[in-house]
């Protein structure tokens, strides 16, 4: 229960704290358990104690194995262990499990994800961040004190995140870094009654005769994925494929995209060489899910060419 | 009380067209989505269609996706589905299912109708 | 499309056996997942629906949970009745795909 795993890189800045907890005016010693050897706290030694905390300045893959601290008090002492890996440095990008700090989950709502351990070191800002070993760049990132914010999360932005940041000990300068995974919760979706965004109803759209005319459906119909929701044109209450006008084509498949977080499809109806007759026709944008239909009507109406010789 | 009731299965060859009804009643057929799901023998269930808003928005498996065609008469309550250029792997027992719009399950079926591909 | 996979693919059990059925998402579906229960020469028929919520007419003995990508259907003491497949089926994207089935048989 006492005994606490912690783990470094070589030559990077590791410090420890004793698992077991006291008042500050407690004094607290530290041992190699192995060969119950003590820790110096004098500062000029690479490895040192310093009261609850134990330092390594820097870290060697030697240093690795298992530390006794005891909190002693007038009236009691208490023994806690401090089981100490260093890893030599990775000459590739991957980040093996073993050097990983807890997984932590954000979502569109909360998506901080905090510098492990870097309250024990003494550091000022900024912290570098890093995803799968790129730096970070983009306003979507921000380093704010000791964590990192993602605007508008996505799925994409799960991942392994390394902050890096510079311990200082009397005037000398450590390097730290430190990973974890982030998942990305799907927040709960929800759907509505489709919402047709465009054309408006009863919308005149004005054409050019012998012109091409591209007519758009769009709506949305809730948050995050959605089930079984389509958009499409109908022409005088007939499918476009049944129609049998090859100049009038719907595209093909359903365009997704996010409106203020909502999920929304559009459909493009294309006219070629616009005849006379697309004007007596009835458009419809029909929106539908599981809630529902909804119907936007258009109708073409004849664009006026500019008379240049008024 | 809901009812659906599947017809016009039977022996086809590869190639062939066959074309499926559903009956339903007991509820606003309009009001639902409609799917056919297949069972091909010994196998799993697999969705092949869904159809819903009046007839108005069509959904296809990959696997039936430009030889099959689904619709509906809402007049007569009924679900269709227009199977062409048949495929021996077609061969199965096809259900139409409602679809609630809560639950997002297929709450009520029929009791199917076996389609067999064969030369 | 979302793979569902179901395990195991077939259980002997008997009559008050406590049996569970899990299902796996190939990515998170939240909880848009219903459980179906079919026997031979039938239609399927509607269990569970948005992961652990009964549908109208089921005996209390069924259950499921789970969210994300991984799902259970416990049946807390196996009746004669529910000798039978059973199946699982995500209506979070589309298509909608169902798990390869479990067949739950007399030991």
């Known amino acids: 229960k006492f005994s606490k795993q912690s783990w470094g890189l070589e030559n990077e800045a590791l410090i420890v704290r004793c698992p077991r907890q006291g008042k500050p005016s407690y004094t607290v010693d530290w041992y190699y358990s192995q060969t119950n050897k003590s820790i110096p706290t004098q500062e000029r030694n690479r490895v040192f104690a310093s009261g609850q905390l134990l330092k390594f300045l820097p870290a060697a893959v030697a240093d690795s194995g298992i530390y006794t601290c005891i909190v002693r008090s007038p009236t009691f002492n208490r023994t806690g262990y401090a089981n100490v890996t260093i890893y030599k440095k990775q000459s590739d990008c991957n980040v093996p499990d073993y050097l990983m700090y807890s997984t932590v989950s954000g979502s569109e709502k909360n998506s901080k994800i905090y510098c492990p351990t870097i309250d024990l070191y003494n550091w000022t800002a900024p912290l570098e961040w890093f995803k799968n070993c790129q730096a970070l760049q983009g306003s979507r990132y921000r380093a704010h004190k000791s964590f990192l914010v993602i605007d508008n999360v996505m799925t994409e932005d799960a991942g392994d995140y390394t902050c890096k940041f510079i311990h200082n000990e009397n005037g000398a300068n450590y390097s730290v870094t430190a990973t974890r995974s982030f998942t990305v919760k799907d927040e709960q979706g929800f759907s509505l009654f489709p919402v047709i965004g465009a054309p408006a109803q009863n919308e005149i759209k004005e054409v050019e005769i012998g012109k091409n005319a591209n007519l758009t459906c769009s709506a949305c119909f809730g948050k995050g994925t959605q089930f079984l929701a389509a958009v499409l044109w109908q022409l005088n209450g007939t499918k476009i494929t049944d129609f049998g006008e090859p100049r009038i084509q719907q595209e093909e498949g359903q365009n997704q995209s996010f409106s203020n977080g909502l999920a929304c499809l559009d459909m493009v109806l294309r006219i070629a060489d616009v005849k006379e007759e697309d004007l007596l026709l009835q458009y419809d944008c029909l929106a539908l899910n599981l809630h529902g239909l909804r119907r936007h009507t258009v109708r073409l109406s004849r664009k006026n060419p500019i008379d240049h010789h008024s | 009380e809901v009812q659906l009731l599947e017809s016009g299965g039977g022996l086809v060859k590869p190639g062939g067209s066959l074309r499926l009804s559903c009956a339903a009643s007991?509820?606003?057929?309009?009001?639902?989505?409609m799917s056919w799901v297949r069972q091909a023998p010994g196998k799993g269930l697999e969705w092949v269609s869904a159809i819903g808003g009046s007839g108005a928005g069509t959904y296809y498996a990959d696997s039936v996706k430009g030889r099959f065609t689904i619709s509906l008469d809402d007049s007569k309550n009924t679900l269709y589905l227009q199977m062409n250029s048949l495929k021996t792997e077609d061969t199965a027992v096809y259900y139409c299912?409602?679809?609630?719009?809560?639950?997002?399950?297929?709450?009520?079926w029929g009791q199917g109708t076996l389609v067999t591909v064969s030369s | 499309d979302i793979q569902m996979t179901q395990s195991p693919s077939s259980l002997s059990a008997s009559v008050g056996d406590r049996v569970t059925i899990t299902c796996r998402a190939s990515?998170?579906?939240?909880?848009?997942l219903a459980w179906y229960q079919q026997k031979p020469g039938k239609a399927p028929k509607l269990l569970i629906y948005s992961a652990s919520s009964l549908q109208n007419g089921v005996p209390s003995r069924f259950s499921g949970s789970g969210s994300g990508t991984d799902f259970t259907l416990t049946i807390s003491s196996l009746q004669p009745e529910d000798f039978a497949t059973y199946y699982c089926?995500?209506?979070?994207?589309?298509?909608?795909?169902f798990g390869q089935g479990t067949k739950v048989e007399i030991k």
């Open positions: 089926q995500q209506s979070y994207s589309t298509p909608p795909t």
């Open positions: 990515q998170s579906i939240s909880n848009w």
């Open positions: 007991g509820f606003t057929f309009s009001s639902y989505w």
């Open positions: 299912a409602r679809l609630s719009t809560v639950t997002r399950g297929f709450d009520y």
